[in-house]
Each structure stands twice: as structure tokens, then as C-alpha cells.
Amino acid sequence: ARSEDRYRNPKGSACSRIWQSPRFIARKRGFTVKMHCYMNSASGNVSWLWKQEMDENPQQLKLEKGRMEESQNESLATLTIQGIRFEDNGIYFCQQKCNNTSEVYQGCGTELRVMGFSTLAQLKQRNTLKD
Amino acid sequence: LWMHKVPASLMVSLGEDAHFQCPHNSSNNANVTWWRVLHGNYTWPPEFLGPGEDPNGTLIIQNVNKSHGGIYVCRVQEGNESYQQSCGTYLRVRQPPPRPFLDMGEGTKNR
């Protein structure tokens, strides 16, 4: 397995642990969601990654100005996404790069599922069922 | 002891079986146990479900219903070492869409 596909809870550096919550979010399109990470903030800065599918490699999250916001209050880092869309579906990871070792550690990830009908075809299918 | 990442969620239709893997790099004598945390309920301790089924520590839940929803976490322990815990997989139980009232074969319709 690739190194990013495995993790452990080492007894090593203080930045080797990042706790992420929640594990899963399902919300309707247009809602606001928040995900959180708790870590030793003195060890290094936190960034956010995103991947659409389980088997993909996470990429650096491009924060959409005015809609996505990252904040940090000491040990607690928060990613807020407003007006969620279907293209926001995926798994979000917080990541910390250790100041002293340059090692990188990730949280477990938060899966976001945006609910609702994404295509006209899905909407038609639902109406057919109702009929 | 390494724990490999597991899917963040698993969607299973009502009445089907749910299979959870606990991938790790431990030797054969590792002790794998399964626990469930109710989603949004952070009470401790989580519900103990039992040991894993095979060398991979698989958990199988048969005939899934709505009450099975939650986060399923496995713990792996080697000897007296402290356990390692998986990130957990959220089980989503899907209600199959209702069959339309007039869902009948063409032959039936033409009778």
C-alpha cells in the first residue's frame, strides 16, 4: 500500500497525531458544513486536502473564496464550506507538516455526501416513480 | 503495527449483508475486535460487537436494517502492546426505492 494509505498512532513526535471529526457528513445541497481537526499546533501548520474517490490520491484543497474558509484557534482547525454543491462531494483530510522533522501526518478524513438530485435524469426518474 | 485506511462510508441496501475489512500488517496472532459508535453520539464506551471472523479480521453483518447504522471501528492488538484503531467506516443503510404501483410486465398489462 502507498504510505498515504496507511497510518499508525506512533508514540513519536507530538505532531504524529491528528484527530478529525466527523467521519461522515450527509447534507442537502445549499447547506453549510464544518469539519474539525485537533492537533498540537506548535508542531506545524495545518492544510486541507480533498479527494473525490477512495482510491485517488488527495490533492491540496483549492479554497473557493467567499464559500470555503479555514480557521485555526490554537489546537483546533476548522474547514467551513458554505452553500455545498454536488462537486464538493468527496473526502476531506487535514494535514500537518512537522516543523522539526518535515514528516507529514493526516487526519482520518471526513466524507461529505451532498444530497439531492444532481441531474435532470435523476429528477425525471423520481417523477416517474411518483407517477 | 500499521493500520491501512478503510472506506469512510459503506452503503448497503436494507436486508443485504455488510462486510467490513480491517486491513493491517500484523502477524497472525493479532487480536482483532469490532466496535460501533452511533453517529453523532459520542458517549463512551462504544458498543462492543465481537472479534473479527478471519485472518483479515472481517466483520459481517447479515440482513442489515436501519438500526445497524453507525461508525464501525476495528482495533488490532499484538500481545500486550497498546491497540491500534482504524479510522472507522460509516454504515449507511439504504431503503430500496418503492416499486411503482403499476410495475407489471407487458403480458400482464395486455390481459
Epitope: 489546537s75 | 453520539n41 459520542y42 458517549t43 484503531q85
Partner: nanobody, 116 residues
Framework: DVQLQESGGGLVQPGGSLSLSCAAS????????RAWHRQAPGKQRELVAA???????MYADSVKGRFTISRDNAKTTVSLQMNSLKPEDTAVYYC??????????WGQGTQVTVSS
């Protein structure tokens, strides 16, 4: 509003022990992380130890093997057992609680002084 009440601080000689306790006026099912931070004079506040709802712990490198964090869910308390104390452990120690929704609460702080 959530209240956090710390206790157990004081003056102790190097090599001695102290136990800090923090009681939270919030149900344990509403807590994701409980932690202790500290702030020494002229320095930034830093994480000392934390424990989450899964029972996992994290410690600052400087206290590993000397400090132990624990919790009592029935009483919604979090404790910090500090052994082999050093003069550099002198600081104001703050209790910190975080809810699953990301709300963060802080205690008023309790002074720990390690001096001969």
C-alpha cells in the same frame, strides 16, 4: 454556557508530583476532546496533553512519560497526573474542552510552580 472548573495547582519541588482536575458542566456525550494547555510567562499557550472520545491520547514531547491524562465520563472530569516535575513545567495550566460541533471552551487556569 459551559463552565470549566480547574483545581489542584500549587507549589511543588523539582522531582515532585501534582494532580490537576477539571470538571465540565456539560454531558460527556457532548465532548469530543478534553485537553490541558499551559502558558509560561512571556510564552504562547501550548498543548500539554489531550484525550478524545475514543480514549486516544496525545502529549507534547516535553511531557511524554512524565504526565498522564485521564478522564471520568460519569463525572465529566479530565485529570492530569504530573510526575517528575521540572522548573520548566512552571506555568498557568488551562483546561480545554471541544464539542463534536467544534465549540471550544476554556477554564480560568490554575497556577503550577516548580521551585526549590
Amino acid at each position: 454556557d459551559v463552565q470549566l472548573q480547574e483545581s489542584g495547582g500549587g507549589l511543588v519541588q523539582p522531582g515532585g508530583s501534582l494532580s490537576l482536575s477539571c470538571a465540565a458542566s456539560i454531558s460527556s456525550s457532548s465532548i469530543w476532546v478534553r485537553a490541558w494547555h499551559r502558558q509560561a510567562p512571556g510564552k504562547q499557550r501550548e498543548l500539554v496533553a489531550a484525550i478524545n472520545n475514543d480514549g486516544q491520547t496525545m502529549y507534547a514531547d516535553s511531557v511524554k512519560g512524565r504526565f498522564t491524562i485521564s478522564r471520568d465520563n460519569a463525572k465529566t472530569t479530565v485529570s492530569l497526573q504530573m510526575n517528575s516535575l521540572k522548573p520548566e513545567d512552571t506555568a498557568v495550566y488551562y483546561c480545554n474542552v471541544v464539542t463534536p460541533k467544534g465549540h471550544q471552551y476554556w477554564g480560568q487556569g490554575t497556577q503550577v510552580t516548580v521551585s526549590s
